[in-house]
Interface confidence: low
């Protein structure tokens, strides 16, 4: 239904709490450089803008879009053009093509330092002092960082930092208490991240449509029991409300998802029978637990998917009448099928499926033609299966570290003309999927490995989309997203790159690293790794072995020397000497 | 499709009791937990009691602790809610519904103490 006033409206169903995060959110998201302080006084004004529209729908403005709203508080902002030149630019257009600007400058890599926890006492202390600015900042920092990160989840993660302290804070040992549980959250939401941004990609890239076949695919899987009119319902409610937040629309998606959330809760009996744990929490709980819950028990009487879709005779009339309704109910059966495979791997086998209809249907005996496609489908799930096997196999060999080195070898000769830092980023994030995937059921692994390799080989579209360097990426990032995955793993070394001269400097450590924390050690570590690559990039992995193992000595030796800075002059001009030998 | 169907209200002193059953079909009534929910008039619907999907756990809203009793037999796809020492206060439109939600998809039973 329309109403008089739509930040009223937004306002009255959200609540000021969250109401105020999610314009923060936006603002943070947006305008990705300005302080806290400066979007908190935006956030205040545009709030007591939306109660004086409770109060009075008539008033002045108050029937103005959210866009037209926003965007002016944004484009009032002073020194725009200093602070971001020709995001400047957008404020001369009309809505929608101003709000559309700004998306368009959106940066997925902004120049912020990275997100320090300050230590367990001061952050205590300023959580105890002021609650709500302590979280406030929590969602400036990171809603800025990750400009499309999912709002209504940002607000479920700051509700779980704000649990996490209060609990912690009330503790004597506050470090040993805050830390894990902090990095716990942390990890979870740099995973959600990524996850969301590649819905976002999906829907930029090829429209609703790809994001409706993806949803419907992920639902039939978790909800197989719910018919196919249930599965279509929540994909087009649970695409608008993807749409909402990839387009800015922080409001209307955090409201529209409260209203999914309260619909399924209602008709559990048509969806699933796992549903209730989820329902009985709060809000944002509920919402969160309701996009990760346990897939339902399949049915046991599934007739096999032959039946419908390769030996009914009206197989071509069927599919020649409503061809997305009949794609879309192969997706939904083949789909509630197999949980054990991966969105990626179900699409694939769907457009496999619509092309050899498209094909079979033009030809004198369709029957015979498609009758085999089912068959056709095997190389398509090996190949995944195989890549799950070989990868698992060598992260329970290596571990997680050795495991991001193997990687980082590998995409450094697929790629070596990407920049080290990002194939460093890419290979640590991709080794993760080892401690985050390979430790499930087998049934598991699959769905859980390639859907996380598909998001974080999208933030490398992305990253390497800003400056394009390596024609093998730009390859695969340019067709489909479900194609990706398979496209990257085929890459072999590039053959066209002309290897690195071999500089000294890059190669040259200081006592400085000693102190480092663990995690910052191996970046360094890999830094190199990927810059010996780049010299040499048909080195054998004995050879990077060699010189690898070589360089952890001398690191430890040297950071175990009484005059460390005496040990690193010394003996760093003879490891240098020793890996050009190794790699001679 | 979801059918939920209550039956067995009526009117009755304070202090009686009475025993109201929903018949289920349409869904696979064994593997969800269920409530009863009542709307008294002019008022807003109020969550009474719940059970889980195998009729081990119980729950009940304090106005009606130790009074009211829910169980359920998942062979006859039937819900139950015994209601005795009946007060006034009882008096609504009683609802059974999926889960633990107070949402309405059904007519409902008429329950009527009088005083």
């Known amino acids: 239904e329309a109403h008089k006033s739509e930040i009223a409206h937004r306002y009255n169903d959200l609540g000021e709490q969250h109401f105020k995060g999610l314009v923060l959110i936006a603002f943070s998201q947006y305008l990705q450089k300005c302080s806290y302080d400066e979007h908190a006084k935006l956030v205040q004004e545009v709030t007591d803008f939306a109660k004086t529209c409770v109060a009075d729908e008539s008033a002045a403005n108050c029937d103005k879009s959210l866009h037209t709203l926003f965007g002016d508080k944004l484009c009032a902002i002073p020194n725009l053009r200093e602070n971001y030149g020709e995001l400047a630019d957008c404020c001369t257009k009309q809505e929608p093509e101003r709000n559309e600007c700004f998306l368009q400058h959106k940066d997925d890599n902004p120049s912020l330092p990275p997100f320090e926890r300050p230590e367990a006492e001061a952050m205590c202390t300023s959580f105890k002092e002021n609650p709500t600015t302590f979280m406030g900042h929590y969602l400036h920092e990171v809603a800025r960082r990750h400009p499309y990160f999912y709002a209504p989840e940002l607000l479920y993660y700051a509700e779980q930092y704000n649990e996490i302290l209060t609990q912690c804070c009330a503790e004597a040992d506050k470090e040993s208490c805050l830390t894990p549980k902090l990095d716990g959250v942390k990890e979870k939401a740099l995973v959600s991240s990524v996850r969301q941004r590649m819905k976002c990609s999906s829907m930029q890239k090829f429209g609703e449509r790809a994001f409706k076949a993806w949803a419907v695919a992920r639902l039939s899987q978790t909800f197989p029991n719910a018919d196919f009119a249930e599965i279509t319902k929540l994909a087009t409610d649970l695409t608008k409300v993807n749409k909402e937040c990839c387009h800015g629309d922080l409001l209307e998606c955090a409201d529209d998802r409260a209203e999914l959330a309260k619909y399924m809760c209602e008709n559990q009996a048509t969806i699933s029978s796992k549903l209730q744990t989820c329902c009985d929490k709060p809000l944002l709980k509920k919402a969160h637990c309701l996009s990760e819950v346990e897939h339902d028990t399949m049915p046991a009487d599934l007739p096999a998917i032959a039946a419908d879709f390769v030996e009914d005779q009206e197989v071509c009339k069927n599919y020649a009448e409503a061809k997305d309704v009949f794609l879309g109910t192969f997706l939904y059966e083949y789909s509630r099928r197999h949980p054990d495979y991966s969105v990626s791997l179900l699409l694939r086998l769907a457009k496999k499926y619509e092309a050899t209809l498209e094909k079979c249907c033009a030809e004198a005996n369709p029957p015979a033609c498609y009758g085999t496609v089912l068959a056709e489908f095997q190389p398509l799930v090996e190949e995944p299966k195989n890549l799950v096997k070989t990868n698992c196999d060598l992260y329970e060999k290596l571990g997680e570290y050795g495991f991001q080195n193997a990687i980082l070898v590998r995409y450094t000769q697929k790629a070596p003309q990407v920049s080290t830092p990002t194939l460093v980023e890419a290979a640590r994030n991709l080794g993760r999927v080892g401690t985050k995937c390979c430790t499930l059921p087998e049934d598991q692994r699959l769905p859980c490995v390639e859907d996380y390799l598909s998001a974080i080989l999208n933030r490398v579209c992305l990253l390497h989309e800003k400056t394009p360097v390596s024609e093998h990426v730009t390859k695969c990032c340019s067709g489909s997203l479900v194609e990706r995955r398979p496209c990257f793993s085929a890459l072999t070394v590039d053959e066209t790159y002309v290897p690195k001269e071999f500089k000294a400097e890059t190669f040259t450590f200081h006592s400085d690293i000693c102190t480092l924390p663990e995690k910052e050690k191996q970046i360094k570590k890999q830094t190199a790794l990927a810059e010996l690559v780049k010299h040499k990039p048909k080195a054998t992995a004995e050879q990077l072995k060699t010189v690898m193992d070589d360089f952890a000595q001398f690191l430890d030796t040297c950071c175990k020397a009484a005059d460390k800075d005496t040990c690193f002059s010394t003996e760093g001009p003879n490891l240098v000497t020793r890996c050009k030998d190794a790699l001679a | 499709q979801v059918q939920l169907v209550e039956s067995g209200g009526g009117l009755v002193q304070a202090g009686g009791s009475l025993r109201l059953s929903c018949a289920a079909s349409?869904?696979?009534?064994?593997?969800?937990?269920m409530s009863w929910v009542r709307q008294a008039p002019g008022k807003g619907p109020e969550w009474v009691s719940a059970?889980?999907?195998?009729?081990?756990?119980?729950r009940y809203a304090e106005s009606v602790k130790g009074r009211f009793t829910i169980s359920r037999d998942n062979a006859k796809k039937t819900l139950y809610l015994q209601m005795n020492s009946l007060k006034p206060e009882d008096t609504a439109v009683y609802y059974c519904?999926?889960?633990?939600?107070?949402?309405?998809g059904s007519q409902g039973t008429q329950v009527t103490v009088s005083s």
């Open positions: 519904t999926i889960g633990q939600s107070t949402s309405r």
């Open positions: 349409g869904f696979t009534f064994g593997s969800f937990g």
């Open positions: 059970i889980d999907s195998g009729g081990v756990d119980t």
